[in-house]
Interface confidence: low
C-alpha cells in the first residue's frame, strides 16, 4: 500500500461557518435503496446545508429519508449561535477555546483554524464540514480575536 | 495485511510515565485515526481517545484530559499514547485500534476494525 | 456522556442455541453502534458496524439490529468457538463509550 497521504476535498464552499448537526443521520448520504418505487423524499445535504429533494425507491436506505421538507429542516437545521466576540467586557476566554481540535465526523477536510491551548497560539487545521466544536474559525484572525490572550 | 504491533508489558511505580507505541503496517497510516482503549484485569473496555496522524489532532475522553499525551511519528508508521502520574487503578492492558475518520457521509465503513495485540501496564510501589 | 448498558451480564447456553444480547443507549444513537467479541487475553474482534454490517470475515451466524437506543446481537446457533465476552460500543459522539459486556458461557 501507497504510504502517500491522501487529500480529500469533497466540501468547496469555505464561506460556511462551522456546521452543527442536531442528530448525526443529517450527515448520511441520501440512500434510494434497492427498490424501484419512485417516491419523492427529502434528505439533508451536508455540502449545501439545505434539505434537498431526492427519489426513494420504497424500502431500505436509511435516516436522513423525509416525507416533507419541514420535517426534513426540523430535524437537520437550527440557527447557528452568533459568535461570541470578545469586547472590552469579555476579556476571558470563551470555554471552547480550549477545547481540542476536532475535524468532527464528516470528510470534507477545508482549512480552518483553532485555538491551540499548548501552544497558547492559533493554527490550521483540517475541518471535516460538519459536527466538530466552537473552537473552529474561519480566520487566523477571528481565531486570534476571540482566544488569543 | 493490516498490523498494528505494540510494544512489551511494562511495570511502573505510581507517579511514574509509560508510554506505549503500535507500530502500524499494510495500510496508509495517515488514512486513518488511531485510537487507544484500555481494559483494566477482569473489566470492561475504556476509550481514551484518538490522535489523527495526518494533523497530529487529537482528542482525549475527559477523563484523562491533562494526563495523557497521543503523539504519532509518521516517519515510521508508530503512534504512542504516554500517560503520566500513574495510580495503581492505571493498571490495565493497553490498545490500540485503527478507526476512520468517522463517518463520510453514510457509515458504511468498519470502524475500530484492526486491533493492537495489548500492552500490560502495571503500576505497583 | 451517552451510557451504553448490555443485558444479560452473563449467559449460559448450549451448543446449537440461539442467543441474544442487548444493549441499550441512555439516548438516541441512530445506527452508530458496533459489536465486538473478546477471548481471555486476546483484543477485541469486530463482528458488527453500524448496526447491522456484518464486518468482512465474520460467520453469518452473527447478526445486528435496531436504531436508536435499542439494539440487539444475536447467534443464530452458537459453536464451541463462540463462548467469550461480547461488547457493543457507541460511536455516535464523544466520548465513545462501550457496555459493560456480557459473558456468554457453556451451560
Known amino acids: 500500500d501507497s504510504e502517500e497521504d491522501e487529500e480529500h476535498t469533497i466540501i468547496t464552499d469555505t464561506e460556511l461557518p462551522p456546521l452543527k448537526l442536531m442528530h448525526s443521520f443529517c450527515a448520511f448520504k441520501a440512500d434510494d435503496g434497492p427498490c424501484k418505487a419512485i417516491m419523492k423524499r427529502f434528505f439533508f445535504n451536508i455540502f449545501t446545508r439545505q434539505c434537498e429533494e431526492f427519489i426513494y425507491g420504497g424500502c431500505e436506505g436509511n435516516q436522513n429519508r423525509f416525507e416533507s421538507l419541514e420535517e426534513c429542516k426540523k430535524m437537520c437545521t437550527r440557527d447557528n449561535a452568533n459568535r461570541i466576540i470578545k469586547t472590552t467586557l469579555q476579556q476571558e476566554k470563551p470555554d471552547f477555546c480550549f477545547l481540542e481540535e476536532d475535524p468532527g465526523i464528516c470528510r470534507g477536510y477545508i482549512t480552518r483554524y483553532f485555538y491551540n491551548n499548548q501552544t497558547k497560539q492559533c493554527e490550521r487545521f483540517k475541518y471535516g464540514g460538519c459536527l466538530g466544536n466552537m473552537n473552529n474559525f474561519e480566520t487566523l484572525e477571528e481565531c486570534k480575536n476571540i482566544c488569543e490572550d | 495485511q493490516v498490523q498494528l504491533v505494540q510494544s512489551g508489558a511494562e511495570v511502573k511505580k505510581p507517579g511514574a510515565s509509560v508510554k506505549v507505541s503500535c507500530k502500524a503496517s499494510g495500510y496508509t497510516f495517515t488514512g486513518y485515526y488511531m485510537h487507544w482503549v484500555r481494559q483494566a484485569p477482569g473489566q470492561g473496555l475504556e476509550w481514551m481517545g484518538w490522535?489523527?496522524?495526518?494533523?497530529?489532532?487529537?482528542n482525549y475522553a475527559q477523563k484523562f484530559q491533562g494526563r495523557v499525551t497521543m503523539t504519532r511519528d509518521t516517519s515510521i508508521s508508530t503512534a504512542y499514547m504516554e500517560l503520566s502520574r500513574l495510580r495503581s487503578d492505571d493498571t490495565a492492558v493497553y490498545y490500540c485500534?485503527?478507526?476512520?475518520?468517522?463517518?463520510?457521509?453514510?457509515?458504511?465503513?468498519?470502524?475500530?476494525?484492526?486491533w493492537g495485540q495489548g500492552t500490560l501496564v502495571t503500576v505497583s510501589s | 456522556a451517552i451510557q451504553l448498558t448490555q443485558s444479560p451480564s452473563s449467559l449460559s447456553a448450549s451448543v446449537g442455541d440461539r442467543v441474544t444480547i442487548t444493549c441499550r443507549a441512555s439516548q438516541g444513537i441512530s445506527s452508530s453502534l458496533a459489536w465486538y467479541q473478546q477471548k481471555p487475553g486476546k483484543a477485541p474482534k469486530l463482528l458488527i458496524y453500524?448496526?447491522?454490517t456484518l464486518q468482512s470475515g465474520v460467520p453469518s451466524r452473527f447478526s445486528g439490529s435496531g436504531s436508536g437506543t435499542d439494539f440487539t446481537l444475536t447467534i443464530s446457533s452458537l459453536q464451541p468457538e463462540d463462548f467469550a465476552t461480547y461488547y457493543c460500543q457507541q460511536l455516535d459522539s464523544y466520548p465513545l463509550s462501550f457496555g459493560q459486556g456480557t459473558k456468554l458461557e457453556i451451560k
Open positions: 490522535i489523527n496522524p495526518n494533523s497530529g489532532g487529537t
Open positions: 485500534a485503527r478507526g476512520i475518520a468517522r463517518l463520510q457521509w453514510l457509515p458504511t465503513e468498519a470502524d475500530f476494525d484492526y
Open positions: 453500524a448496526a447491522s
